[in-house]
Interface confidence: medium
């Protein structure tokens, strides 16, 4: 059997639990799955978190990797830090372990980077491509406490069955995290049905003391209840719900008072009518009908883009005139051409340079001697149906021989889609993409929303956009932390990414190497970091408060959120970006993301230098969303991956290493 | 235990199409890319087509591409090759292969193959 | 393409001997190659993926090195279920290909 086949596991302690979901996805998807579930992607801190993580990973297939909740965005090398400047997805950078199986390279670290955990061996950290999907993901879950695993008991019929909050059903628990339910089934035929609680006393613990399987008071059948039957001291039974329900009028049922409710965004059980509305942020209650929510347009917020901002139904994006390029916090403008686009510009020739002479190498790109060892993973290759990502791995498939048209990309994702409900936006319908001139803008229909030039002074605090993911309707508030996003618009099914091999045409990306280290790395670098961010270090993490640059571009923005279309080049003027391609990015297509592959989300990279730009850097839509690990947007990869076997680690007293010989690596896609 | 098995093969005349399946199973089929790798008769083995996982994406040798496609339905666990305007090169045993990992392109389980003749 | 050159053709051997099978590519590839054993009339086996993990259930009498454009797999003690085909893969670009294999035979 092979044990990738397994369903997902969990181990839990006192106060979390890691779980293990043998599920191929992206970093994205893989934190999306943890925070539907009410969880995060786990952050082993500790060499005792660590070593819960490695007995629930155990020794799983060799060559498969899990996803951690470990990022870092482009430009944010801190290489002598131990996280080396990547940023737990819970927003900080506190650790007293580290476990990298490469030495930390130098070089500027253009590109956003995620961490995969070796399933296998010593459970090395390596850094690689964020959209790579992977083997699967570890998600970790905390809770205010938990409750012991039952004890066994003579009149059982067999082992305790837990289900956990997060939806995990096992027998083999120590630990029940609260809110988890314990099924019991007696030889008597009967059973019982235990919650984990809150007591009040204080602490957690189960809803019924043993013994359980003694007595008749919820003998037969639960005592006829739903969920839960208590015995009173009288000896007669009364039924109580799970929370989030509540007791149907029969007594023993229990209702979902959420169900019938009549929210259109986000609903909660509680208040007088047993539910209560909510909109998701950047939307507010209708004045005439609480149950519906109407869009707030940002726009009318002064200083919200430094230049010009178009609103849309759940979001917003800025622009920049002609001559002037969005700078990477997607809201000032700077004067067109300036660092980063002569980066890509003389890479064509030595893509696919197969390493023989390293005289020939550019030396910028001889730095990045340390992610993911290009192995081939996927090769480009065309699409059948819109791809997860614009990028996923492994060398990219070759097509047909015809040069591709490269189309510029957002490197901002898109607002999150719900996970379960289908997502219906009142999009606008397009026939064909709208170029935008800064002069004239051209409009696709009366639908249009308005393109307002927006002012330049800061925004003061009660000025500031709490963006939450407009399409993530069925998270609870809780779930949604205020952290800024963007949207990315979705790729059209045709669509390439830029090539940069002038060398190879016919080769167009698809999949990018996976760039993990050769498992052939010797030295295993485990580190014990002493706890503590340095004074200065400012998380990535854009709260609700949280000032946003005031400095704002002369840029306009016209999305618009249609089903997927073809982009068709027109003659009309086009946006200036940071991307030398021939096609706008005012030719945004955005799709409703329930039915586009998942772009990849970004928070605003505070620490990001303002005038620095990547070879590709697209627009920045905004969108209301919560704070999601950045992805910055698909860029333009190999169309091969020719990697060398990674530089042995030779570990140091800090537990980093330089390079015990240099490996020439191919991170060129970055 | 893993398992991939191949159908479909046969004789066929040239200029006809004909479709092989691959039925897997003692794996999650959803987590894995796929792929067809052919062998003719006393000769070594060639690639012939990739989809990844979510069959978002494909590939093909040069020889094959515009007549051949390879797809998947997650749903019943089955791989596909749609082999139209076939030729008397497309003759050999077709394999079935699993690529292992989702950053190596290794095959690390095949099926036993299935032989398809093309003749007149 | 990427041609893999497979040498020799056919390896005449004996039991417990230890062999050298080579293959060589026209372009660097990377570490990015695999070994293969085929019995006549099955499937083929992968014994070896990144020119030198071996695969899960693979005797460790099966080794593999090599990186760029040389490959190698050793067999340090060869047994006569051994005595089969040998094919290399590489995957470090498009398309994937094969060598021709290497035959091992008993002297």
């Known amino acids: 059997q092979d044990p990738w086949a397994a369903e997902p596991r969990a181990a839990c302690g006192p106060s979390s639990c890691y779980a293990l979901f043998p599920r191929r996805r992206t970093f994205l998807e893989a934190w999306r799955a943890c925070r539907e579930l009410g969880g995060d992607l786990a952050t082993p801190r500790t060499p005792e978190e660590a070593q819960r993580v490695d007995s629930l990973v155990g020794a799983g297939p060799a060559s498969r990797l899990l996803w951690i909740g470990l990022q870092r965005q482009a430009r944010q090398c801190q290489l002598q830090r131990p996280l080396r400047g990547f940023t737990w997805t819970t927003g900080d950078q506190d650790t007293a372990f580290t476990n990298w199986a490469q030495p930390a390279s130098g070089g500027p670290c253009p590109a956003q980077r995620c961490v995969a955990l070796e399933a296998s061996g010593e459970h090395r950290w390596l850094e690689g491509s964020c959209t790579l999907a992977v083997d699967g993901y570890l998600c970790q879950f905390g809770f205010e406490g938990a409750c012991p695993a039952l004890q066994d008991e003579a009149g059982q019929a067999g082992p305790a069955v837990y289900t956990t909050p997060f939806h995990l059903v096992s027998t083999e628990f120590e630990w029940l995290p609260f809110g988890s339910v314990a099924a019991v089934q007696c030889q008597a035929g009967r059973g019982a049905s235990l919650l984990c609680v809150k007591q009040p006393e204080g602490g957690v613990g189960w809803s019924r003391a043993g013994p359980l399987c003694l007595g008749t008071g919820c003998s037969p059948d639960n005592g006829g209840c739903e969920h839960e039957c208590v015995e009173e001291v009288d000896g007669h039974v009364s039924c109580r719900c799970t929370e989030g329900f509540r007791l149907a009028a029969d007594g023993r049922s229990c209702e979902d008072p959420c169900a019938q409710a009549p929210c259109e965004q986000q609903c909660e059980p509680g208040g007088p009518q047993g539910y209560s509305c909510h909109c998701r942020l950047g939307f507010r209650p209708a004045e005439d009908d609480p149950h519906r929510c109407v869009d707030t347009d940002e726009c009318q917020i002064a200083g919200v883009c430094q230049q010009m901002c178009v609103n849309y139904v759940g979001g917003f994006e800025c622009y920049c005139s002609e001559g002037h390029e969005l700078e990477a916090d997607g809201i000032s403008c700077s004067p067109a051409g300036a660092m980063g686009a002569q980066a890509s510009q003389d890479l064509g020739d030595e893509l696919l340079d197969d390493g023989e002479d390293e005289e020939d190498e550019d030396e910028a790109w001889k730095a990045f001697n340390g992610g993911w060892t290009e192995m081939p993973g996927i090769l480009w290759m065309e699409p059948t149906q819109p791809p997860d990502f614009a990028l996923a791995y492994r060398p990219s498939f070759p097509e047909d021989r015809e040069p591709q048209i490269p189309y510029p990309e957002p490197t901002w994702p898109p607002p999150l889609s719900a996970p379960r409900v289908p997502y219906h936006s009142s999009v606008l319908s397009v026939t064909r993409p709208v170029v935008v001139s800064a002069t004239h803008p051209t409009l696709p229909s009366a639908h249009q929303p308005p393109v307002i030039p927006a002012t330049h002074p800061a925004l003061s605090r009660d000025h500031q956009i709490p963006v939450i993911a407009a399409n993530y309707p069925d998270l609870p508030s809780a779930y949604q932390p205020g952290i800024l996003s963007v949207s990315h618009s979705a790729q059209p099914p045709a669509h390439q990414p830029p090539m940069i091999s002038t060398k190879y045409p016919e080769l167009f990306p698809a999949h990018q190497s996976p760039m993990f280290p050769d498992t052939r790395v010797a030295g295993t670098q485990t580190t014990t970091h002493l706890p503590g961010i340095p004074p200065n270090h400012a998380p990535l993490v854009t709260t609700l408060g949280a000032q946003l640059p005031p400095q704002a571009p002369d840029a306009l923005v016209l999305r618009t959120q249609a089903t997927q279309l073809p982009i068709i080049p027109t003659a009309q003027p086009s946006l200036t970006t940071t991307s030398r391609s021939p096609v706008s990015p005012a030719h945004q297509i955005s799709v409703p993301a329930a039915t586009q592959p998942a772009a990849l989300p970004t928070l605003l990279p505070s620490q990001s230098p303002t005038n620095q730009t990547s070879p590709i850097s697209p627009t920045h839509p905004h969108s209301k969303a919560p704070q999601i690990p950045r992805e910055d947007g698909p860029s333009p990869k190999l169309a091969l991956w020719l990697p060398s076997p990674a530089p042995t680690a030779a570990p140091t007293a800090l537990g980093e290493a330089g390079l015990a010989e240099h490996s020439q690596r191919d991170d060129r896609w970055l | 235990e893993v398992q991939l098995v191949e159908s479909g093969g046969g004789l066929v005349q040239p200029g006809r199409s004909m479709i092989l399946s691959c039925a897997a199973s003692?794996?999650?089929?959803?987590?894995?890319?796929m792929a067809w790798v052919r062998q003719a008769p006393k000769m070594g083995l060639e690639w012939v087509a990739t989809?990844?996982?979510?069959?978002?994406?494909?590939n093909y040798r040069d020889s094959v591409k515009g007549r051949f496609t390879i797809s998947r339905d997650s749903a019943k666990n089955t791989l596909y090759l749609q082999m139209d305007s076939l030729t008397s090169e497309d003759t050999a045993t077709y394999y079935c292969?699993?690529?292992?990992?989702?950053?190596?392109?290794?095959?690390?389980?095949w099926g036993p193959g299935t032989m398809v003749t093309v003749s007149s | 393409e990427t041609v893999m050159t497979q040498s020799p053709t056919s390896m005449p051997t004996s039991i417990g001997e230890r062999v050298t099978l080579n293959c060589k590519a026209s372009?660097?590839?990377?570490?990015?190659v695999d070994w293969y054993q085929q019995t006549p009339g099955q499937s083929p086996k992968l014994l070896i993926y990144t020119a030198s993990n071996r695969h899960t259930g693979v005797p460790d009498r099966f080794a593999g090195s090599g990186s760029g454009r040389d490959f190698t797999l050793t067999i340090s003690n060869v047994e006569a279920e051994d005595l089969v085909v040998y094919y290399c893969l590489q995957y470090g670009s498009l398309p994937f290909t094969f060598g021709a294999g290497t035959k091992l035979e008993l002297k």
């Open positions: 292969a699993r690529h292992g990992s989702s950053y190596y392109w290794f095959f690390d389980f």
């Open positions: 989809i990844t996982y979510d069959g978002s994406r494909t």
């Open positions: 003692g794996f999650t089929f959803s987590n894995f890319d």
């Open positions: 372009q660097s590839v990377g570490i990015n």
